[in-house]
């Protein structure tokens, strides 16, 4: 049986939830890691794409070391949510020229999808500050050509694997800090 | 053909500093962590630190925190790294190397700079 | 941090026979569908080369008679039939946590 009623939950172990985390966070980073080299594979397209509407590169925001762990997953959140919006984006708007790379789209979606539930957990099991609601963001102008889809899409999926590189990074330096 | 070129070998004295460079090419920079080993006589592999070349700074093994320092150059293509403070501990061969981003496995070395500490 | 040890420590050969060499680490190192863990041979004055990464995927230039097979504490590595360029120094790394480390190294020797 479990704790009698009105006792309080026992407190969770923060480097194993911590720990959960960084696990769905590397999987995910995997996952967009074989989606990039096949959209590499299948529309080659050289040198850097940009988006103005995804968000300015998490490592920007200071040097990892120097990280808390409320700022990390409050970041990483927002950040998340935002390249959420831009995959759901993607496949709307890109679904035919894309279809070659579904289900994996799909699947990273779900996967984002689930890491933002993680991530909205731990923060509410570490007791740190609950963000507001997002307000609601612009909706995203459809592209201007096929081409323009593509180098959308390498721009996603590159913004997206250089945050969760930093996510597991600062994640896995902060579990050694606990 | 992608490869790492390090600079030559260095003869220091203790309480001196070297700094050793890494210049990629072959490869887009930026796509990987640059990781740094350090192979000492008779002694494991062991992993100083690495650093993302788009920003955010380094991070360290705790054992090398203070006195490594990672930097890259960007427009270079190069990263260095500097270890302050020598001791004889510190002579071994220190490698650069590229990691793949979130798993810390190295799937291309450099050539190895050999770092003698003596007095 | 977390320990690799390596078994054997030195390991004499013929060229044509089986290797398997043995890595342990001191917690779990596999978690959700990986493993990491990586192999990487060294030769005597060279850098070390990837060899397997996340436990059993080969890297892109190595010859199929290697393959890396294992999950949680326990992981191998195979050389199914040895050849004169494999006598070298293997080492074992994980990257489940920081920092990551490497085992003490196994050599392979000629008979």
């Known amino acids: 049986p479990g704790p009698p009623p009105g006792s309080p939950r026992a407190s969770p172990d923060p480097r194993a939830e911590l720990d959960s985390t960084v696990l769905l966070t590397r999987s995910l980073l995997e996952d967009t890691r074989q989606l990039t080299i096949q959209l590499k594979d299948k529309f080659p397209a050289d040198g850097d794409h940009n988006l103005d509407s995804l968000p300015t590169l998490a490592m920007s925001a200071g040097a990892l070391g120097a990280l808390q762990l409320p700022s990390v997953l409050t970041r990483l959140r927002a950040d998340l949510l935002s390249y959420l919006r831009h995959v759901q984006w993607l496949r709307r708007a890109m679904g035919s020229s894309l279809k070659t790379l579904e289900p994996e789209l799909g699947t990273l979606q779900t996967r984002l999808d689930r890491l933002l539930r993680r991530l909205q957990l731990l923060m509410s099991r570490l007791a740190l500050p609950q963000l507001p609601p997002d307000p609601p963001a612009p909706p995203l102008a459809p592209p201007s050509s096929t081409w323009g889809g593509i180098r959308a899409a390498h721009a996603i999926l590159g913004g997206l694997h250089l945050t969760l590189d930093w996510a597991v990074r600062g994640l896995l330096l902060l579990k050694t800090r606990l | 053909e992608v490869q790492l070129v390090q600079s030559g070998a260095e003869v220091k004295k203790p309480g001196a500093s070297v700094k050793i460079s890494c210049k990629a090419s072959g490869y887009t920079f930026t796509d990987y962590n640059m990781d740094w080993v350090k192979q000492a006589p008779g002694q494991r592999l062991e992993w100083i630190g690495d650093i993302n070349p788009h920003g955010g700074g380094p991070i360290y093994n705790q054992k090398f925190t203070g006195r490594a320092t990672l930097t890259v150059d960007k427009s270079a293509s190069t990263a260095y790294m500097e270890l302050s403070s020598l001791r004889s501990e510190d002579t071994a061969v220190y490698y650069c190397?590229?990691?793949?981003?979130?798993?810390?496995?190295?799937?291309?070395w450099g050539q190895g700079t050999t770092v003698t500490v003596s007095s | 941090d977390i320990v690799l040890t390596q078994s054997p420590a030195s390991l004499a050969l013929s060229p044509g026979e089986r290797a398997t060499l043995s890595c342990r680490a001191s917690?779990?190192?596999?978690?959700?569908?990986?493993?990491?863990i990586h192999w990487y041979q060294q030769k005597p004055g060279q850098a070390p080369r990837l060899l397997i990464y996340l436990a059993s995927n080969l890297d892109s230039g190595v010859p199929a008679r290697f393959s890396g097979s294992g999950s949680g504490t326990d992981f191998t590595l195979t050389i199914s039939s040895l050849e004169e360029e494999d006598f070298a120094t293997y080492y074992c790394?994980?990257?489940?946590?920081?920092?990551?480390?490497f085992g003490q190294g196994t050599k392979l020797e000629i008979k």
């Open positions: 917690k779990s190192v596999s978690t959700s569908g990986y493993s990491y």
């Open positions: 790394q994980h990257s489940r946590d920081l920092p990551p480390t």
């Open positions: 190397a590229r990691g793949e981003l979130g798993h810390w496995y190295f799937d291309v």
